[in-house]
Interface confidence: low
């Protein structure tokens, strides 16, 4: 399987909410011995590999934000800890998973990584990640709503997030 990032860049005004999204692509084993972890963290564009550095999002580690379930089951973070920090991660039946950040500040700007780990009990684990940039802007140049830029080069038209 692979992870797709529908949007590579999110440009948002301060105070807005944003939902960063990743999508699990390809065949997903739904067997009893397969479990999926999905999570989010901040990183930097390293020389060797993007997303190798794992930093917290608003002081929450990716352990705090993780979802675990089998196959394409739905899940979301219900614990108060994340919500107190204005964060919620969620996953649906179709392989989409996301993190919602509320009341953005300039400090939220940076590189965000989604990580999926497929664990096959007694066998191995397989990890894939996706990266996207969040730019939080203030002042007269800031957009009135979040503007997202598709990852694919052939589809460069801006899409305004709902």
């Amino acid at each position: 399987f692979k992870v797709a990032t529908p949007y590579s860049l999110y440009v948002c005004p301060e105070g807005q909410n944003v939902t960063l999204t990743c999508r699990l692509l390809g065949p997903v084993d739904k067997g009893h011995d397969v479990t999926f972890y999905k999570t989010w963290y901040r990183s930097s564009r390293g020389e060797v590999q993007t997303c190798s550095e794992r930093r917290p999002i608003r002081n929450l580690t990716f352990q705090d934000l993780h979802l675990h379930h089998g196959g394409h089951q739905a899940a979301n973070t219900s614990h108060d800890l994340a919500q107190r920090h204005g964060l919620e991660s969620a996953s649906d039946h179709h392989g989409n998973f996301s993190i919602t950040m509320r009341n953005l500040t300039l400090l939220d700007s940076g590189l965000y990584c989604c990580l999926v780990v497929e664990i096959r009990h007694h066998h191995s684990e397989h990890r894939v990640h996706g990266a996207m940039e969040l730019q939080v802007q203030t002042g007269k140049d800031a957009p009135s709503n979040c503007v997202v830029y598709p990852s694919s080069s052939q589809d460069s038209e801006n899409i305004t997030a709902a």
């Epitope: 999570t39 590999q49 190798s52 352990q63 675990h68 664990i119 009990h121 684990e125 990890r127």
Partner: antibody
Framework: QVQLVQSGAEVKKPGSSVKVSCKAS????????ISWVRQAPGQGLEWMGG????????NYAQKFQGRVTITADESTSTAYMELSSLRSEDTAVYYC?????????????WGQGTLVTVSS | DIQMTQSPSSLSASVGDRVTITCRAS??????LNWYQQKPGKAPKLLIY???SLQSGVPSRFSGSGSGTDFTLTISSLQPEDFATYYC?????????FGQGTKVEIK
């Protein structure tokens, strides 16, 4: 601060079994992979297997398959490693190790080690 | 299984020296490579994770590089407390495997 505290040294006869415990404190237990790594005298590090308590099932190195059992008790935040059919070459220090990164196998927390001596 | 081969198996160096230890994987492991330091009678200590990320609390004289199959641990200026055995470890796939170790001794 996470701490892993292991049970004390053991002296065992060949053919018997040993069960070593590893109690975690200072952090959540269930979602983190706990591994067992052994080191024979003067030798290198050897991964035996690991368990993610929330999943309940363990993952073993082929070399130990059928002879090692790794379990976890979420209620006491304790992981166990049982090795059966002991032989002299199993004499080693056995470490439990854990990652800060949940399911991963980057070991930034280690127990103090448990010396298991197999001798007739 | 993924085999990890370290070189050299031992080396002698002086305080202040620049020391380089290499680790080679039998197949590509991307950057899923960690380095540990172990002193006699003690548990290993994580120095570098993800090939090049410095573990919190580890002095900046330690650095890691590489990707794929070839990796390097560098100590830019060896200190007295750095004399120890160093291990690489891949966590790309289970079974987890370690290199055989490199003992850094005082010249």
């Amino acid at each position: 601060q996470v701490q892993l505290v292991q049970s004390g040294a053991e002296v065992k006869k060949p053919g018997s079994s040993v069960k070593v415990s590893c109690k975690a404190s200072g952090g959540t237990f269930s979602s983190y992979a706990i591994s067992w790594v052994r080191q024979a005298p003067g030798q290198g590090l050897e991964w035996m297997g690991g368990i993610i308590p929330i999943f309940g099932t363990a993952n073993y190195a082929q070399k130990f398959q059928g002879r090692v059992t790794i379990t976890a008790d979420e209620s006491t935040s304790t992981a166990y490693m049982e090795l059966s059919s002991l032989r002299s070459e199993d004499t080693a220090v056995y470490y439990c190790a854990r990652s800060s990164y949940g399911w991963s196998y980057e070991f930034d927390y280690w127990g103090q080690g448990t010396l298991v001596t197999v001798s007739s | 299984d993924i085999q990890m081969t370290q070189s050299p198996s031992s080396l002698s160096a002086s305080v202040g020296d620049r020391v380089t230890i290499t680790c080679r994987a039998s197949q590509s492991i991307n950057n899923d490579l960690n380095w540990y330091q172990q002193k006699p009678g003690k548990a290993p200590k994580l120095l570098i994770y993800a090939a090049s990320s410095l573990q919190s609390g580890v002095p900046s004289r330690f650095s890691g590089s590489g990707s794929g199959t070839d990796f390097t641990l560098t100590i830019s200026s060896l200190q007295p407390e750095d004399f120890a055995t160093y291990y690489c470890q891949q966590n790309r796939a289970t079974p987890i495997t370690f290199g055989q170790g490199t003992k850094v001794e005082i010249k």
